[in-house]
Interface confidence: low
């Protein structure tokens, strides 16, 4: 049993059909010795008297708010919450694996620039008595400080019957330094808690491997005379990081017609500018990536071609 | 060229090949970036290898005050990583082809470490740590995780020639 | 002549962890990579992860992994495997072996692990 | 992983007969990185063969190893008594290393 936040412990379960359980001496929190009653939640009936409460937690009917009392007082709280370990893994109820980049995804990352601020997004079907705590640091033997805010809900979609909900979080290393190589990796840890199930999900990750730009800005058509070339031209965009002859991009330009079926033509470069020829009811996107480290690719940004 | 406290390196060129360190780099693992192989004790063995942190003076700022400090931490990170892609991890079983990537990658490391620092000066190099693994799945390990650093390694020289190129040439 | 001694037999409860330990003599340690094997009874070789003791990098089967702890401890040439959360079917005689380039050259005793409640 | 499939599980054969044990891989195996083991009761395993056909220091010529790519073969030329038992091929050319079913050699 360990200590989550004040007056909440975590009850550490091996979850296999007639497991022992976990025995727990709960402690009022008073000075008085004698008199003191145990309650569970809201019911009345009596579970013991006495300044400590031995119980054998096996399973949810468990856990919960226990509460020592004298007379009509109420004197501490004490809410115990299960984390269950099933061959050897801990559960992983609460959040739906993303699947991506690989199996037991559950936190995904992103940052759009090397200033040490990132964003965590997770999934989950569960819509109600649901809280989300984060913290992060850069390594873990000496940790370095990472600041994150509240998680939010940020978007609801359905998803064939189910609702499916995206709780996000914003996440700034107190210490950057964009130029520098990453030797220790950031973690993530996401404390979830649904009712009384406790589950905690980490992340491990270099931002460079979590850069994805944002797309191209100003993208803009400049036909050439007497030609069905145009030039393209683009700027960065204004989330990169600067100076942009150090924090260089590379782009992806590519001319596709109405129909998906018909063949695109890429053009790759470093340069802010192409020319490309421009078939009628095509289209023209560009799109941005690190040009030093192979990391995602900026979703495109796009202009029909007339 | 950079000789120690002396003129600039000729940062076109470096940029040059510095980029093409960084395709290399990719293209002799592909795969790197999204396999996950860190392990618990990655913290530690990530220090095995030389990084070009904060105070090394590689950012802009750093290289306009005085690019010395940098080019020296970069080129002891080149002749570390020439030594490691020439060593039994990559020159051992399972062998590798002769014109593979890792084998232009060790070429170019070589070449760039050059143009920072030619013939008759010096400056401390790192200790390489004496590998010797045995077994087919180390060498593959440690195949993925010296190539990983390396692409880390390489972007932030390929950042530094391309701004010094944009802004401290001649 | 590299020799490799385990740790004795076990009996463990459902649930608990194991530790055995496997101690090389008689040749150098940190260069080869230790592979733990297991055998269930009447059962074949499963394979369970692997350590460089040099590098200190550990190498677990996916089966394992999450469950297994792989460790070595180059000042007594001993390297040591941990497997949590036991259960029946984890009842096994577990191997550690020298992980050569030819193979798995030098194998321990065996070390009996039972699992039952 | 990489799936080893040894065929037959059991080889029934008397003293002096010849033995041809056959280990299949699901995908190439690297470099034929592959060894064979042979394992009698109460024992642990012996190294009989490495690199698909090399013979371990102090195994008799008997035992000898071939194949490439997906298919290797094991034969005792001339079964002694003391090789009846059971024998495992091994793969490690992969970082997650794997051994087949296993082959008994029993006597007729």
């Known amino acids: 049993i360990w200590e989550l936040k004040k007056d909440v412990y975590v009850v550490e379960l091996d979850w296999y059909p007639d497991a022992p359980g976990e025995m727990v001496v709960l402690t009022c929190d008073t000075p008085e010795e004698d008199g003191i009653t145990w309650t569970l939640d809201q019911s009345s009936e009596v579970l013991g008297s006495g300044k400590t409460l031995t119980i054998q937690v096996k399973e949810f009917g468990d856990a919960g708010q226990y509460t020592c009392h004298k007379g009509g007082e109420v004197l501490s709280h004490s809410l115990l919450l299960l984390h269950k370990k099933e061959d050897g893994i801990w559960s992983t109820d609460i959040l739906k694996d993303q699947k991506e980049p690989k199996n037991k995804t559950f936190l995904r990352c992103e940052a759009k620039n090397y200033s040490g601020r990132f964003t965590c997004w997770w999934l989950t079907t569960i819509s109600t008595d649901l809280t989300f705590s984060v913290k992060s640091s850069r390594g873990s033997s000496d940790p370095q400080g990472v600041t994150c805010g509240a998680a939010t809900l940020s978007a609801e979609r359905v998803r064939g019957d189910n609702k499916e909900y995206e709780y996000s979080v914003e996440c700034q290393e107190d210490s950057a330094c964009p130029a520098a190589e990453e030797s220790l990796p950031i973690e993530v840890m996401v404390d979830a808690v649904h009712k009384l199930k406790y589950e905690n999900y980490t992340s491990s990750f270099f931002i460079r491997d979590i850069i994805k730009p944002d797309p191209p800005k100003n993208l803009q058509l400049k036909p050439l005379k007497n030609s069905r070339q145009v030039e393209v031209s683009w700027e960065y965009p204004d989330t990169w990081s600067t100076p942009h002859s150090y924090f260089s991009l590379t782009f992806c330009v590519q001319v596709q017609g109405k129909s998906k079926r018909e063949k695109k033509d890429r053009v790759f470069t470093d340069k802010t500018s192409a020319t490309v020829i421009c078939r009628k009811n095509a289209s023209i996107s560009v799109r941005a990536q690190d040009r030093y480290y192979s990391s995602s690719w900026s979703e495109w940004a796009s202009v029909p071609c007339s | 060229r950079a000789v120690p406290g002396g003129s600039s390196p000729a940062w076109t060129q470096c940029q040059q090949l510095s980029q093409k360190l960084c395709t290399l780099a990719w293209s002799a693992h592909p795969l790197v970036g999204h396999m996950d192989l860190r392990e618990e004790g990655d913290e530690e063995t990530t220090n095995d290898v030389p990084h070009i942190q904060c105070g090394d003076g590689c950012d802009p700022q750093g290289l306009r005050d005085n690019s010395q400090f940098c080019l020296q931490r970069i080129h002891q990170g080149l002749i570390f990583y020439e030594k490691l892609l020439g060593s039994d991890i990559f020159t051992g079983e399972p062998s590798l082809l002769p014109d593979s990537p890792v084998a232009q990658l060790h070429a170019s490391l070589l070449g760039l470490s050059q143009l920072l620092q030619p013939e008759g000066h010096h400056w401390e190099t790192q200790q390489i740590p004496s590998l010797s693994p045995s077994q087919p799945w180390q060498r593959l390990l440690l195949r993925f995780k010296i190539l990983r650093s390396l692409q880390a390694f390489v972007a932030v020289a390929a950042r530094v020639f391309a701004h010094g190129a944009a802004t401290l040439s001649p | 002549q590299v020799q490799l001694v385990q740790s004795g037999a076990e009996v463990k409860k459902p649930g608990s962890s194991v530790k055995v330990s496997c101690k090389a003599s008689?040749?150098?340690?940190?260069?080869?990579?230790i592979s733990w094997v297991r055998q269930a009874p009447g059962q074949g070789l499963e394979w369970m992860g692997g350590?460089?003791?040099?590098?200190?990098?550990?190498n677990y089967a996916q089966k394992f992994q999450g469950r297994v702890t792989i460790t070595a401890d180059e000042s007594t040439s001993t390297a040591y495997m941990e497997l949590s959360s036991l259960r029946s079917e984890d009842t096994a005689v577990y191997y550690c072996?020298?992980?050569?380039?030819?193979?798995?050259?030098?194998w321990g005793q065996g070390t009996l692990v039972t699992v039952s409640s | 992983d990489i799936v080893l499939t040894q065929s037959p599980a059991t080889l029934s054969l008397s003293p002096g007969e010849r033995a041809t044990l056959s280990c299949r891989a699901s995908?190439?195996?690297?470099?034929?990185?592959l060894a064979w083991y042979q394992q009698k009761p109460g024992q642990a395993p012996r190294l009989l063969i490495y690199g698909a056909s090399s013979r371990a220091t102090g195994v008799p010529a008997r035992f000898s190893g071939s194949g490439s790519g997906t298919d290797f073969t094991l034969t005792i030329s001339s079964l002694e008594p003391e090789d009846f038992a059971v024998y495992y091929c091994?793969?490690?050319?992969?970082?997650?290393?794997?051994f087949g079913q296993g082959t008994k050699v029993e006597i007729k």
């Open positions: 008689g040749g150098t340690f940190s260069n080869y990579a």
């Open positions: 072996a020298r992980d050569i380039y030819a193979g798995m050259d030098v």
């Open positions: 995908q190439s195996v690297l470099g034929n990185y």
């Open positions: 091994h793969q490690y050319g992969s970082i997650s290393t794997t």
């Open positions: 350590i460089i003791p040099m590098f200190g990098y550990a």
